[in-house]
Amino acid sequence: VSITKCNSDMNGYCLHGQCIYLVDMSQNYCRCEVGYTGVRCEHFYL
């Protein structure tokens, strides 16, 4: 899978994680930090 960094306009899209662009799927994706989940890594779980 080819990935690259998200466009600058997506800065802040992922609240607790890194935004990556999945080129082959044409999708922005939030790779969440440990302890976080949700489309935008907005939910904390224990």
């Epitope: 466009n7 600058s8 306009d9 802040g12 899209y13 609240l15 922005n28 994706y29 935008r40 907005e42």
Partner: antibody
Framework: QDQLVQSGAEVKKPGASVKVSCKAS????????IQWVRQAPGQGLEWMGR????????KYREKFEGRVTITADTSTNTAYMELSSLRSEDTAVYYC?????????WGQGTLVTVSS | DIQMTQSPSSLSASVGDRVTITCKAS??????IAWYQQKPGQAPRLLIQ???TLQPGVPSRFSGSGSGTDYTFTISSLQPEDIATYYC????????FGGGTKVEIK
């Protein structure tokens, strides 16, 4: 099926304000950004600004700063664009556009006519 | 704001011709450019995103290329149904549309 349904056509007097709504279904606007784009009759497409409904953060095109306000009500899954001090040049079709995980998905457009 | 200079503003070509439209950004947009087709009275239709990624259902005669500040949109063999106005859109930093290219049949 994802949808963005915009409010109906409006006719306004110069100097008045207009508020256009954009109701989302099939997805949560908190997972997206909502952009607003307009197109005057016979003219090109013009980006106006956008909102992050989760953080309630906005970005506006410089020429609209102070005259446009973009808001979102996450309880009703609806975004709004209000434009004040209307003039004849604001006569246009206004579109809301979803962006975020996937690329842009457009509403059907709302015609705003400014006429005395 | 990033400026997008699209050219030509209009063109006339014959059915079967190769048609090329260019967009030049005022700064590097890192391949974050999309191309839209718009027919009179209709909302814009997304054809291509991320420079060259064709949307599902879009004919393969449409293609895009480029990098840095210079981008190209090509219709390899113009068809009567391609008569429309085409817009580029940079979405790297905020958003800016090009001025549009009206494509007509000769």
């Amino acid at each position: 099926q994802d949808q963005l349904v915009q409010s109906g056509a409006e006719v306004k007097k110069p100097g008045a304000s207009v508020k256009v709504s954009c109701k989302a279904s099939g997805f949560n606007i908190k997972d997206t950004y909502i952009q607003w784009v307009r197109q005057a009759p016979g003219q090109g497409l013009e980006w106006m600004g956008r909102i992050d409904p989760l953080r309630h953060q906005t970005k506006y095109r410089e020429k609209f700063e102070g005259r446009v306000t973009i808001t979102a009500d996450t309880s009703t899954n609806t975004a709004y664009m209000e434009l004040s001090s209307l003039r004849s040049e604001d006569t246009a079709v206004y579109y809301c556009v979803r962006s975020g995980r996937e690329f842009d998905f457009w509403g059907q457009g709302t015609l705003v006519t400014v006429s005395s | 704001d990033i400026q997008m200079t699209q050219s030509p503003s209009s063109l006339s070509a014959s059915v079967g011709d190769r048609v090329t439209i260019t967009c030049k950004a005022s700064q590097d947009i890192h391949k974050y450019i999309a191309w839209y087709q718009q027919k009179p009275g209709q909302a814009p239709r997304l054809l291509i995103q991320y420079t060259s990624t064709l949307q599902p259902g879009v004919p393969s005669r449409f293609s895009g290329s480029g990098s840095g500040t210079d981008y190209t949109f090509t219709i390899s063999s113009l068809q009567p149904e391609d008569i429309a106005t085409y817009y580029c859109l940079q979405y790297d930093n905020r958003r800016t549309f090009g001025g549009g290219t009206k494509v007509e049949i000769k």
